[in-house]
């Protein structure tokens, strides 16, 4: 049985989680990119669930096109460069899911831009934080 | 379907410069993220590098840094691979091949390839 | 840089029988692996993609697994043609690397 310290690690690191999906949002979102109608082209592969952490699989591997959307990006709109930030990322939902279990994800058959890709699992963080706290 | 087609076998001598082309044909170029293999007599396959043809970033591997520059025109849909201060060591088949994210999760990866130009380098 | 580790170098195997190679990652890569098929004076061919996902117009014979950072080609019962060289590639990260790849040879 996960023990409170535990919970608390796992409520800690999907806080960071979703901070750093909200800040990439709020940076692809902001009036002064350019290159939003090109990124909007990317298609993104959206889990047919995600109710649980071992899902963090198919955002995991929706990653590597995360990080070239970003490399569209004008540096200044984030705080890291998109390496960095991915990087982060992968660490944390590394940490989340684990890397013993290959959990085999299940895509939905609809495609999404990055904009509703990232708005599924900042909710998909919320939801998991929701039930932690 | 997508095909890539390169320009033909070169031989060149130590020190000097090749620029190999690879034209995109059933689909616009800036689709897509054009990069560069290569792979010596009887070896393995080496990532050379790649570049985003809508706004020409470009991305390399540290031991070509300094020696390679791939470009692109998207009037012609081509890409190009100019390898300079040529050595024996880089004989080889240079293959161009495609990565996109604006279709399916298969062509993520290198799904198209070029027949390859094998460059020899001989002095 | 991530460095994959191919065995055996080369495979002697006849037809019909179960052919299955091995690709170890120097680090975690999760299912960012791909295998390709290469034969003499050819291009390499894309096989599997996302370490488990069959190309289009590639024979249910290949699979891919994954376990780790350990990767496995199988190939269910050997074809003439299946006889080439094999290499597994990583997309986790920049530089992009492959294996030195397995020989597949007819016994």
């Known amino acids: 049985a996960p023990t409170s310290s535990s919970t608390k690690k796992t409520q800690l690191q999907l806080e960071h989680l979703l901070l750093d999906l909200q800040m990439i949002l709020n940076g692809i979102n902001n009036y002064k990119n350019p290159k939003l109608t090109r990124m909007l082209t990317f298609k993104f592969y959206m889990p047919k669930k995600a109710t649980e952490l071992k899902h963090l699989q198919c955002l995991e591997e929706e990653l590597g096109p995360l990080e070239e959307v970003l490399n569209l990006a004008q540096s200044k709109n984030f705080h890291l460069r998109p390496r960095d930030l991915i990087s982060n990322i992968r660490v944390i939902v590394l940490e989340l899911k684990g890397s013993e279990t290959t959990f085999m994800c299940e895509y939905a058959d609809e495609t999404a831009t990055i904009v509703e890709f990232l708005n599924r699992w900042i909710t998909f963080c919320q939801s998991i934080i929701s039930t932690l706290t | 379907q997508v095909q890539l087609v390169q320009s033909g076998a070169e031989v060149k001598k130590p020190g000097a410069t090749v620029k190999i082309s690879c034209k995109v044909s059933?689909?616009?170029?800036?689709?897509?993220?054009m990069h560069w293999v290569r792979q010596a007599p009887g070896q393995g396959l080496e990532w050379i590098g790649r570049?985003?043809?809508?706004?020409?970033?470009?991305k390399y591997a540290e031991n070509f840094k300094g020696r390679v520059t791939i470009t692109a025109d998207t009037s012609t849909d081509t890409a190009y691979m100019e390898l300079s201060s040529l050595r024996s060591e880089d004989t080889a088949v240079y293959y161009c091949?495609?990565?996109?994210?604006?279709?399916?999760?298969?062509?993520?990866?290198?799904?198209?390839w070029g027949q390859g130009t094998l460059v020899t380098v001989s002095s | 840089d991530i460095v994959l580790t191919q065995s055996p170098a080369t495979l002697s195997l006849s037809p019909g029988e179960r052919a299955t190679l091995s690709c170890q990652a120097s680090?975690?890569?999760?299912?960012?692996l791909s295998w390709y098929q290469q034969k003499p004076g050819q291009a390499p061919r894309l096989l599997i993609y996302?370490?488990?996902s069959l190309a289009s117009g590639i024979p249910a014979r290949f699979s891919g697994s994954r376990s780790g950072t350990d990767f496995t080609l199988t190939i269910s019962s050997l074809e003439p043609e299946d006889f080439a060289v094999y290499y597994c590639?990583?997309?986790?990260?920049?530089?992009?690397?492959f294996g030195q790849g397995t020989k597949l040879e007819i016994k």
């Open positions: 680090q975690y890569i999760g299912n960012y």
């Open positions: 570049i985003d043809p809508d706004d020409d970033s470009t």
């Open positions: 590639l990583q997309h986790y990260s920049t530089p992009y690397t």
């Open positions: 996302q370490a488990t």
């Open positions: 091949t495609t990565i996109t994210f604006l279709y399916t999760r298969e062509l993520r990866w290198f799904a198209y």
């Open positions: 059933g689909d616009t170029i800036t689709a897509y993220y």
